[in-house]
Amino acid sequence: SPVPRSTALKELIEELVNITQNQKAPLCNGSMVWSINLTAGVYCAALESLINVSGCSAIEKTQRMLNGFCPHKVSAGQFSSLRVRDTKIEVAQFVKDLLVHLKKLFREGRFN
């Protein structure tokens, strides 16, 4: 049976926690990604940003999990209007910011 949305979100949070806690060297060799607007459509926007990072095994599971939350197919080079224009940040900071936001959504009971 499909995993409840609340469980899927919790699993995504757990994965992001693992990434931030287990970080030894710079995450994804310090790769930069587009910063996103966290207020709406966060899952697709996060995936659109992170999908452009290739060859980084540390975030592959996160990419797969975000794909499960996003209703449409996302491919590299695709950007929605949710991107913060011309602002790039390191993947490590992106993951931290995303984690804070997703934990708040979870605590508020906003699973959709």
């Epitope: 609340s6 469980t7 919790k10 949070i13 757990e14 926690v17 806690q21 934990k103 708040k104 979870f106 605590r107 508020e108 009971g109």
Partner: antibody, heavy 123, light 107 residues
Framework: EVTLRESGPGLVKPTQTLTLTCTLY??????????VDWIRQPPGKGLEWLAH???????RYNPALKSRLTISKDTSKNQVVLKLTSVDPVDTATYYC???????????????WGQGTLVTVSS | DIQMTQSPSSLSASVGDRVTISCRAS??????LNWYQQKPGKAPKLLIF???MKPRGVPSRFSGSGSGTDYTLTISSLQPEDIATYYC?????????FGGGTKVEIK
């Protein structure tokens, strides 16, 4: 040292509103990842979770009592207040407040508890 | 709501005995299971969190295990000061729910 102290009226009449205060010592509810829960225990019975408030004012309630409960915080006084409206004798219980810390995963484990305050609902 | 069922509801054992208390959840709680000890007339105290992790100061004789829906609290060698009621609590899904408690007495 982390401690929590509940205070309440002791005796409340049916239909009245019960107001309970939890004063926090040794930590601040303005600190990220801190939360406070209210739990009650009727005499000789088990534990029932009532409500929770996080440092950033996110509030959650037990659905069975949600319409009667309000949780709030006063960061300047380091206090959390719980109000329970339209009380009934079945609300007679020891009311506890407890601290939750969410570091990393979201645990909802209450690591420090107050000593509890007994509230009797009777006319 | 997730229902938490503890067994036994009470037990009597001798000092030095190994004691096990079971807790079953009505659905998978993914290791978000906490145990509390409540001595008579006192507030509960956190004993185990996230199935098997212990706060500082909890004696080594207490341990927790389990996964999915089934969890266990073990006291490897019962001591007189362990007389209390023990509660499990799931922290996976709101509303938070507790087991009915297991009262531990000394023979």
């Amino acid at each position: 040292e982390v401690t929590l102290r509940e205070s309440g009226p002791g005796l409340v009449k049916p239909t009245q509103t019960l107001t309970l205060t939890c004063t926090l010592y040794g930590f601040s509810l303005s600190t990220s990842d801190m939360g406070v829960d209210w739990i009650r225990q009727p005499p000789g019975k088990g534990l029932e979770w009532l409500a929770h408030i996080w440092w950033d004012d996110v509030k959650r309630y037990n659905p069975a009592l949600k319409s009667r409960l309000t949780i709030s915080k006063d960061t300047s006084k380091n206090q959390v207040v719980l109000k329970l409206t339209s009380v009934d004798p079945v609300d007679t219980a020891t009311y506890y407040c407890a601290r939750t810390v969410s570091s990393g995963y979201i645990y909802y484990a209450m690591d420090y508890w107050g000593q509890g305050t007994l509230v009797t609902v009777s006319s | 709501d997730i229902q938490m069922t503890q067994s036994p509801s009470s037990l009597s054992a001798s000092v030095g005995d190994r004691v096990t208390i079971s807790c079953r959840a009505s659905q998978d709680i993914r290791n978000y299971l906490n145990w509390y000890q409540q001595k008579p007339g006192k507030a509960p105290k956190l004993l185990i969190f996230y199935t098997s992790m212990k706060p500082r100061g909890v004696p080594s004789r207490f341990s927790g295990s389990g996964s999915g829906t089934d969890y266990t609290l073990t006291i490897s060698s019962l001591q007189p000061e362990d007389i209390a009621t023990y509660y499990c609590q799931q922290g996976n899904t709101l509303p938070l729910t507790f087991g009915g408690g297991t009262k531990v007495e000394i023979k």
